[in-house]
């Protein structure tokens, strides 16, 4: 728990350099996100493909989309889960991180020092051991997060199933209902290829209790979709006299000394380009 209050931001006096004053874990071990670069990567043949069960959510069901002042969050049902880890990990929520229109490079994890445009996190908790995400969040092996790197490219109708509701959650505390859809559509191609490491929540309280799976391949959203994400939301309540745009809501990469990130793929990426045979 924070030593003193729960106010934190990505900018200004309560920005990430100050997080550890109120949230000691933010200055502690196993912090995320990190830069994924070749000299910390090690292939691990035991990293088998994950199975995504109960991810196809019925449109007859309503799911709560919330502006929590830090991101836009979609609540997920407890019968949605990942199979293939040591325990069952049940979904609790997904949210995104992004940059701003002038610098649209707001992913949390970087690859060889390069940011992607944005990043999706699908948060799960160890439901074999703990009754809910809140209880699990500060426990060993408590959380498992799937991270999807997002780049600018073609229009993505699946991501638009979230983005089309942003106007109803413009301000902190606002909530809207989203029809269920297949959450697996938000994942990239070849989900069997991923990075795996032990890390933390990337927001306060920064608990070092997360098993990270960062998919190797990015998904694409259009420039218009990215711009909508970067311009639609505010960190402040509707009646706040000093509104603050919700931009650059990503944490800087953290030091990652004397540890390894394991990959489910051997690192040679086969390139096929027009004109090459």
């Amino acid at each position: 728990a924070p030593v003193n209050g729960s106010k934190w931001t990505y900018f200004g006096p309560d920005g990430e350099n100050s997080w550890s004053k109120k949230y000691p874990s933010c200055g502690g071990l196993l912090q995320s996100p990190i830069d994924l670069h070749s000299d910390i990567l090690q292939y691990d043949a035991s990293l088998t493909p994950l199975e995504f069960q109960g991810y196809n959510l019925s449109a007859n069901k309503q799911f709560l989309l919330t502006n929590n002042g830090h991101s836009v969050k979609l609540n997920l049902p407890s019968d949605m889960h990942i199979q293939g880890l040591q325990s069952r990990y049940s979904a609790t929520q997904l949210h995104l991180h992004w940059g701003n229109p002038n610098d649209p490079h707001g992913s949390e994890h970087t690859v060889s020092g390069q940011h992607f445009a944005a990043e999706l996190h699908i948060v799960h908790y160890n439901s074999d051991l703990y009754p809910d995400a809140s209880t699990a969040s500060n426990k060993s092996e408590g959380l498992a997060v799937l991270a999807v790197l997002i780049e600018m490219g073609s229009f993505n109708p699946s991501y638009d199933k979230i983005f089309s509701h942003l106007q109803h959650v413009k301000y902190k505390g606002q909530e809207a209902f989203v029809p269920g859809f297949n959450i697996e559509e938000l994942l990239p191609e070849r989900t069997a290829e991923y990075y795996r490491y032990r890390g933390s929540l990337t927001t306060p309280p920064c608990n070092p209790t997360v098993l990270w799976t960062v998919f190797r391949n990015p998904v694409q959203i259009s420039q218009e979709q990215l711009l909508a994400l970067e311009t639609a939301l505010y960190c402040t309540h509707m009646d706040d006299p000093s509104p603050r745009e919700m931009i650059n809501n990503f944490r800087q990469v953290q030091k990652f000394d004397e540890r390894l990130v394991y990959t489910s793929f051997s690192q040679v990426q086969v390139c096929t380009a027009a004109g090459l045979s």
Epitope: S58, E175, F177, P179
Partner: antibody, heavy 121, light 106 residues
Framework: EVQLVESGGGLVQPGGSLRLSCAAS????????IYWVRQAPGKGLEWVGY????????TYNQKFKGRATISVDKSKNTAYLQMNSLRAEDTAVYYC??????????????WGQGTLVTVSS | DIQMTQSPSSLSASVGDRVTITCRAS?????MHWYQQKPGKAPKPWIY???MLASGVPSRFSGSGSGTDFTLTISSLQPEDFATYYC?????????FGQGTKVEIK
Amino acid sequence: EVQLVESGGGLVQPGGSLRLSCAASGYSYTDYNIYWVRQAPGKGLEWVGYIDPANGDTTYNQKFKGRATISVDKSKNTAYLQMNSLRAEDTAVYYCSRPIYYGAYWYFDVWGQGTLVTVSS
Amino acid sequence: DIQMTQSPSSLSASVGDRVTITCRASSSVTYMHWYQQKPGKAPKPWIYGTSMLASGVPSRFSGSGSGTDFTLTISSLQPEDFATYYCQQWSSNPLTFGQGTKVEIK
């Protein structure tokens, strides 16, 4: 025929609690959420909360958070609304209802007949 | 919360009259739904998705609007139309209903 039937209403003392039932039939029970909506005498409709019968996940109107608890018994195709610390203003007809998705939105296509709860000493 | 204000709260009209009920939302909503309720009965779905008539609803009913202003119109009032009509939005949590418009016989 799709049906929702509420029961459990009656006279309750102020400060007391109620437990209402909503029995569903005629459709695949876990495919739709069940909502509770109430209507005070001569007043409008007010949403209390809902439950996903497939997993028991609940969402409440903030106004009722902490005082209302919705639960489900899948084996009986029945949802329950428990409300505590009742006051006179909780006197209402309580309905359960089922929303259906139609292309781009939901609407309540099936309603129960309602059950009257009177809070009075 | 999105407040839904219906006007008028009640109206008296004669059979054959054209009747318009307005629902104004305090913030923009995507769709509006309408329910009909008769005394001692549960509400019935009447118009959904702003303009779609529910099963069995006569074609003299219509719905329209966008943003914050929506209307339910009865082109020629019939005896069976005397009831209370409620609008409802599902765009924001909590979902909210209007306070109702009671259509009475003049």
